[in-house]
Interface confidence: low
């Protein structure tokens, strides 16, 4: 069978010898000269010659990939003695590898774009594109502004995907100061091999003319965004802060303020249309919503079409207005033969408030249950508490269920507390402490959970 890989050849070869392409080889070839290799197809015998004894192929001329990137040839191996082929005729490909031998070229010498004076820095105002007959890295183009009165007012960014130059605004424009700018933009190849520098400068330039359009500008807020904060216990009509906006045009038209009601559907906030003061129109609750993100609009009174918007982030500050409560519904059991001071349940609490230094809950039995209780509460001082047995042995026939009222306090200001009830069922257990028989309900609800009352 034939043995070769695809052949690759560099274009624009400048060596004095013929350029070596590769070797055709049949595994029937024993190296005794009995086989003859024949080449046919694209450029065979002219562009490409083969050593009929060894199968070595050479290119006789300088090739240009931009003229023809691929050559398709056919190979034969013939037994010299019999004249018969020892391999079926087979097709192979010679691919011409690109070098950077073509410069970028602008299809036109002048471009013109227009942009409103209100275009912020970074705004794209037009695209220009040079073409390059090379491929891949050799066809990559970099654009730069090399000269012109707009040198410091505009930038050109190279779009790596499209290989276009995007002209962008660099500094704020002013129609009253200057209406037309002229730039010289250059397109160049960033990757140029030093050995091919003789082929040319690998760049081209074009003139770009930019016309600035006059704009009646909308009001401008003093900040890009406002962050305000208010306590959740604020009364209605409490002022939170204010926004200010000005008409940047020479006319300095007066402005009026309003809240975009799409961003405040519940009408929680209001604004003084004259001075921009923000105040509450409803009571707040941090636990319902921590941040209110609303938009304020400033509109020119003389020209309502000219308006601007600014985001307002209002943070509601926590006030201790929620009582802690059990994290779960606690229903547990105690063995009849339990010893005193055994831990039978750990209690956890939650609180919707968010104190600065974290929660510090305390747990205790409600006063009415504290004396003579069969159980004690041990406050672990880590926002948990344990229920401990207080005596040796319980009789489920005497008392099958105990309801323990537990007071949870948050120790914040003002102090908030609630009472939750823990249900303790008395059960018969084996000597390992495993529950054997119990009040029916305890088996139906094995330690499942919700808030204690």
């Amino acid at each position: 069978s034939w043995m070769w890989n695809q052949f690759f050849l560099l274009e624009e070869y400048t060596g004095s010898d013929y350029q070596y392409v590769g070797k055709l080889h049949s595994d029937q070839d024993r190296g005794d000269g009995s086989l003859k290799y024949i080449l046919s197809g694209d450029g065979a015998g002219d562009l490409f010659i083969i050593n009929e004894n060894t199968g070595d192929i050479q290119a006789t001329k300088r090739l240009d990939r931009e003229e023809k990137p691929v050559y398709i040839l056919r190979a034969q191996a013939i037994n010299r003695r019999t004249g018969r082929p020892v391999e079926p005729e087979s097709e192979f490909i010679i691919k011409i590898h690109d070098i950077n031998d073509n410069e970028p070229i602008f299809p036109q010498s002048t471009y013109q774009f227009k942009t409103p004076e209100s275009s912020p820095p970074g705004t794209p105002i037009g695209r220009i594109k040079a073409s390059d007959a090379d491929v891949g890295e050799n066809a990559e183009i970099e654009y730069s502004i090399t000269d012109g009165e707009g040198l410091d007012m505009f930038d050109v960014i190279t779009d790596q995907e499209t290989q276009e130059g995007i002209i962008t605004v660099k500094k704020l424009l002013d129609f009253e100061k200057k209406k037309v700018y002229t730039l010289k933009v250059e397109a160049s190849n960033p990757y140029v091999e030093p050995r091919f520098l003789y082929l040319g400068p690998f760049k081209d330039s074009a003139t770009v003319r930019i016309v600035v359009e006059d704009v009646d500008e909308p009001p401008v807020f003093s900040k890009l965004a406002y962050i305000l904060q208010i306590r959740e216990d604020a009364q209605i009509n409490t002022t939170i802060g204010s926004v200010t906006a000005q008409d940047p045009d020479a006319a300095r038209n007066p402005v009026k303020y309003s809240v975009d009601r799409h961003t405040d559907m519940d009408r929680i906030f209001n604004i003084d249309s004259g001075n921009g003061s923000i105040f509450t129109s409803k009571l707040l609750d941090r636990e319902t919503l921590l941040w209110h993100n609303i938009t304020v609009i400033a509109t020119e009174i003389n020209n309502p079409k000219q308006s601007s918007r600014v985001p307002l982030y209002i943070k509601v500050l926590d006030v201790n207005d929620n009582a802690p409560e059990f994290a779960e519904f606690y229903e547990t059991f105690v063995c009849e033969k339990a010893k005193a001071d055994q831990l039978i349940q750990t209690l956890h609490a939650v609180d919707k408030d968010d104190p600065y230094s974290g929660h510090q809950f305390s747990f205790s039995l409600a006063p009415e249950a504290a004396s003579g209780s069969n159980f004690t509460i041990q406050d672990n001082k880590d926002n948990t508490a344990g229920i401990l047995t207080r005596k040796n042995g319980y009789n489920r026939h005497e008392m099958s269920t105990y309801l323990l009222p537990v007071v949870i306090s948050d120790n914040d200001y003002p102090v908030q507390s609630s009472t939750g009830t823990v249900t303790v069922r008395v059960c018969a257990c084996d000597h390992h402490g495993n529950m054997q028989s119990c009040h029916a309900e305890a088996l139906i609800h094995p330690t499942g959970l919700s808030t204690g009352a």
């Epitope: 900040k223 890009l224 965004a225 406002y226 962050i227 921590l290 230094s357 974290g358 880590d382």
Partner: antibody
Framework: EVQLVQSGAEVKKPGASVKVSCKAS????????MHWVRQAPGQGLEWMGW????????EYNQKFQGRVTITADRSTSTAYMELSSLRSEDTAVYFC???????????????WGQGTLVTVSS | DIQMTQSPSSLSASVGDRVTITCKAS??????LAWYQQKLGEGPKLLIY???TLQTGVPSRFSGSGSGTDFTLTISSLQPEDFATYYC????????FGQGTKVEIK
């Protein structure tokens, strides 16, 4: 993608001031806290302070209070940290880091600058 | 102020080893803890936040656990690129870092 590019290394004399810059790109500069953290040679990390570029509000580590000033230029999306009355123990690499808003000023830091070495030597 | 204590301060391990670094807070910080990796001459890189959430793009061999005062960073199978210094950081009240754990090649 998010990038924080810091200014180059500085050599200062004791008593002088240094101002390090941190240019942000790839996100809305005004909407995230920018923190400054330093690392003395062979040492751990030490938080210095933050700025919220949206309104210029700052908070500083008590240790540096009065010596450090953090500012931000919204037009160039650049944050600055200036440290005055330099002493030899201020020799460190100074990092800017973007804070992820997590209910308070910045939570953890998801992107860091490459660091700026400040050497204080007479 | 909250102090963060990391241990060990350094450790030697081989590629493929399971590595565990611990971090202890001087008070309850709930889950407000992040882990960072720092290589020589570079800025730190976020690995884990909120004690156990993996940052986007970080390999799954890194994991975090813990809550309250005790936290752990685990590298399930150490890779050559994991040799670095690791820091924990609390962001519950202010910002404080552990002193770092240097993971070296055995």
């Amino acid at each position: 993608e998010v990038q924080l590019v810091q200014s180059g290394a500085e050599v200062k004399k004791p008593g002088a001031s240094v101002k390090v810059s941190c240019k942000a790109s790839g996100y809305t500069f005004t909407r995230n806290f920018m923190h400054w953290v330093r690392q003395a040679p062979g040492q751990g990390l030490e938080w210095m302070g933050w700025i919220y570029p949206g309104d210029g509000e700052t908070e500083y580590n008590q240790k540096f209070q009065g010596r450090v000033t953090i500012t931000a230029d919204r037009s160039t999306s650049t944050a600055y940290m200036e440290l005055s009355s330099l002493r030899s123990e201020d020799t460190a690499v100074y990092f800017c880091a973007r804070g992820v808003y997590g209910g308070f000023a910045g939570g953890y830091f998801d992107f860091w600058g490459q660091g700026t070495l400040v050497t204080v030597s007479s | 102020d909250i102090q963060m204590t990391q241990s060990p301060s350094s450790l030697s391990a081989s590629v493929g080893d399971r590595v565990t670094i611990t971090c202890k807070a001087s008070q309850n910080i709930y889950k407000n803890l992040a882990w960072y990796q720092q290589k020589l001459g570079e800025g730190p890189k976020l690995l884990i936040y909120d004690a156990n959430t993996l940052q986007t793009g970080v390999p799954s061999r890194f994991s975090g656990s813990g809550s309250g005062t005790d936290f752990t960073l685990t590298i399930s199978s150490l890779q050559p690129e994991d040799f670095a210094t690791y820091y924990c950081q609390q962001y519950y009240s202010g910002w404080a870092f552990g002193q770092g754990t240097k993971v070296e090649i055995k």
